[in-house]
Interface confidence: low
């Protein structure tokens, strides 16, 4: 299966409804500690305000944030853990009317209630230590 | 800790092409994603490529297509191939090491010292 740039970057329209689909596999053990990020973007600029920020510490911690007038909010952290050392996933943020809701290989992990207006969101950009087969909007 | 020195600069018409190289010392190199940043008088500091360990790649959308990074994990080298020089590629050029891939220049610890690359037209 042919590989997806990374950082990956794609303008997007989201609204409740919409599901964005991630296929990538860490591209290190988790010795050494490989990152996930995957940004919602209010603007096709990576310097942009962030409504939803979700960066994986794999083998370790999940963050989620925002970041508007360029500071960075309060972060929501979570211990859970799904990913696998070396394994390929499957990850789908779900947009719901109140929340985003992020599925890993099929089961909800993660939820973040919106505090930018989803409508806002310009581009995702997905970026790191991954290697990425799958990027995929669904509204 | 990782050193990284760059080469290969220097004037050339527009339209022309030139090769720039980037030696790091250390044993650990393969252990880090390689960039190419590069930087204009008065501007800030742009991202032009990068590439991960395993020679994954992206580059800026003002070099697609003209520029491109390579690595060569048996001796320590990063090459930038740059075709079609415009006189806005004109900047200095910097290497950068850093563990995780990125284009934001605030992910990468190592940096050297650039190497001035001018075109003119």
């Known amino acids: 299966m042919s590989l997806l740039s990374v950082p990956h970057t794609e303008s997007v329209s989201l609204s409740t409804g919409s599901t964005v689909t991630i296929e990538a596999r860490p591209l290190v053990c988790f010795f050494n500690e490989p990152h996930l990020q995957v940004d919602f973007h209010t603007e096709m600029k990576e310097d942009s305000d962030i409504a939803f920020h979700f960066q994986v510490y794999f083998g370790n911690r999940v963050v989620m944030n925002s970041r508007e007038y360029r500071t960075w909010k309060e972060e929501v952290e979570s211990k859970n853990m799904p990913f696998q050392d070396g394994q390929e996933f499957e990850l789908r943020i779900l947009v719901l009317e109140d929340k985003y809701q992020v599925m890993v290989n099929g089961q909800a992990y993660y939820n973040f209630n919106h505090r930018i207006p989803v409508s806002s969101v310009k581009m995702v950009q997905v970026w790191r230590d991954i290697s990425l087969t799958k990027f995929n909007v669904s509204n | 800790e990782l050193q990284v020195v760059e080469s290969g600069g220097g004037l050339v018409q527009a339209g022309g092409s030139l090769r720039l190289s980037c030696a790091a010392s250390?044993?650990?190199?393969?252990?880090?994603?390689m960039a190419w940043f590069r930087q204009a008088p008065g501007k800030e500091r742009e991202f032009v490529a990068a590439i991960t360990r395993s020679g994954g790649n992206t580059y800026a959308d003002s070099v697609k297509g003209r520029f491109t990074i390579s690595r060569d994990n048996a001796k320590n080298t990063v090459t930038l191939q740059m075709n079609s020089l415009k006189p806005e590629d004109t900047a200095a050029y910097h290497c950068?090491?850093?563990?995780?891939?990125?284009?934001?220049?605030?992910?990468?610890?190592?940096w050297g010292q650039g190497t001035q690359v001018t075109v003119s037209s």
């Open positions: 950068a090491a850093g563990g995780t891939y990125s284009f934001v220049p605030r992910s990468y610890n190592y």
């Open positions: 250390g044993r650990t190199f393969s252990t880090y994603s």
